[in-house]
Interface confidence: low
Amino acid sequence: DTHKSEVAHRFKDLGEEHFKGLVLVAFSQYLQQCPFEEHVKLVNEVTEFAKTCVADESAENCDKSLHTLFGDKLCTVATLRETYGEMADCCAKQEPERNECFLQHKDDNPNLPPLVRPEVDVMCTAFHDNEATFLKKYLYEVARRHPYFYAPELLFFAARYKAAFAECCQAADKAACLLPKLDELRDEGKASSAKQRLKCASLQKFGDRAFKAWAVARLSQKFPKAEFAEVSKLVTDLTKVHTECCHGDLLECADDRADLAKYMCENQDSISSKLKECCDKPLLEKSHCLAEVENDEMPADLPSLAADYVESKDVCKNYAEAKDVFLGMFLYEYARRHPDYSVMLLLRLAKAYEATLEKCCAAADPHECYAKVFDEFQPLVEEPQNLVKQNCELFEQLGEYKFQNALLVRYTKKVPQVSTPTLVEVSRNLGKVGAKCCKLPEAKRMPCAEDYLSVVLNRLCVLHEKTPVSEKVTKCCTESLVNRRPCFSALELDEAYVPKAFNAETFTFHADMCTLSEKEKQVKKQTALVELVKHKPKATKEQLKGVMDNFAAFVEKCCKADDKEACFAEEGPKFVAASQAALA
């Protein structure tokens, strides 16, 4: 399916609006520090060029690859060396090395100010004054902060963002209409970004075999009535889509995602009975809907797995003939029967099954050797079941904030070398698993909890890879994708860690504490808690609780005082001294 001009092909397939949006996202994800106006200028130049190629595919440079065209355009940025340092060296390379170089310089934690939400009236005025610029600014600000955001999905978020303003800026109470919608988009956006980051990490760090295994398990749970061949086709197509998006090939990715949605809607009968309501929607909404679709009902008459995978005398023959296909079929069959298992658990079971066959098919009596393979699965299944049960009980007992604090203490003791902001961010997100999953029925708890934890722990791995400080974290992050969560769960107090020297500055607070939002206050307190644990890793729960209760009382007292700053100056050192004494 070759085209004389790739850029013309994609422009025609996607249409001008989506083409421009995706190019803006691509450029913003690569050059995260560039000002908005610079990116808009580059996008307009690329778009004008694409239009000349649509008019005449044989025109000069129209035959160049998209990487060449986009890379050449990025390398025209005058301040590349001053703004990005060594990333400018990418421009001396030829494709495909140049694009690889740009990808390697994507920054998961860019030094950008947090987005401040202006007053509703200010936003509505900006929206009405120039809707196109307003929406481009949204794409730009999200893309530069989330360099792996799933680009076609970001277009869907932008469409929802536009719809929210179009509706609410005309409402009687604009704020009451708009703010909950923006909060929802923000939270969903962060979740979407983190989920996509795990997909990209899976592809980039563990290869497409790892991603395909994940996709087989997840799609088999979603579409248990589909044949293995159908699931395999969807997995192949989905892998291509995500490989492209994770590789910065956003136009190809969006185009292929649209093709996949079209295929699924044309073949609903052989995939799932749940697709119907998605397929009536417009493209962006349709693709989103298909990605989030609920699991179809399991066929009633599924036979036992043991016949084909344990009792059969042909197991080793079938395995030897096509290992990956045989294991893929095993994973498919197991997953479609177990929507109650997390994808990561299903992948561990497939891995255990593979290890057993590797060992047993070389033994004197293979059948005797692998006859009890399903019994070996029991501890693997019970471990996440018990973990979810214990943590949901703890969450219900403590509530979200204190549950987060328990996790902060737990993880700081495991990996005290990790930076405090990272420990706070990751532990707060780990703690959100309670509200997200513990209210669900038993059959949905494990897939919700463990697969969410995998996403959050991937964030820890991604941040740690940028600045490696802990061999334990490196080990858990690199050894096995499917065993990351059990690896972190199994970590104990780091006995080799030399406690951090006490720094009174870390525990010095000011009157500005009082004007912070509830969330910001929590983050301040949790930051202090992590620093306490780094100072006294062997402190007991009771000691830490005592100090944190005193801290809350001290802040509350000073925020009620007439001279708040004087109170903090006077009471602060007393709190520090009392805390040191309590932890001695």
């Epitope: 390379k93 090395e97 690889e100 170089c101 390697q104 980039q204 760090k205 563990f206 290869g207 890879e465 490696p468 400080v469 802990s470 061999e471 490196t474 690199t478 050894e479």
Partner: nanobody, 115 residues
Framework: EVQLVESGGGLVQPGGSLRLSCAAS????????MSWVRQAPGKGPEWVSA????????RYAESVKGRFTISRDNAKKTLYLQMNSLKPEDTAVYYC????????GSQGTQVTVSS
């Protein structure tokens, strides 16, 4: 499990050369940047050199620039450090590490430069 096994160290005269190797297993070697770190007697670990996952981007500490060359063979899952024009102050235990960390987790290989 992640394993890094260094070899190639030894006793060499000033001005001489050595080639260190680090055999990796238990992780997707080709996906990670790697570094060499050294620790002289009585001193803390010192980062020496780093290489990106594909082998295109290499970095060196000022003290070894122009004398040491880092390289890798992803097919063999092996990291190398070619050390030329060795000086007595290069005497140390050399470790390979994942990422650009100055911490050490393997056994290391002793390099002694002395006449």
């Amino acid at each position: 499990e992640v394993q890094l096994v260094e070899s190639g160290g030894g006793l060499v005269q000033p001005g001489g050369s050595l080639r260190l190797s680090c055999a990796a297993s238990g992780f997707t070697f080709g996906s990670f940047g790697m570094s060499w770190v050294r620790q002289a007697p009585g001193k803390g670990p010192e980062w020496v050199s780093a290489i990106d996952s594909g082998g295109a981007d290499t970095r060196y500490a000022e003290s070894v620039k122009g004398r040491f060359t880092i390289s890798r063979d992803n097919a063999k899952k092996t990291l190398y450090l070619q050390m030329n024009s060795l000086k007595p102050e290069d005497t140390a235990v050399y470790y390979c590490t994942i990422g650009r960390s100055a911490s050490r987790g393997s056994q290391g290989t002793q390099v002694t430069v002395s006449s």
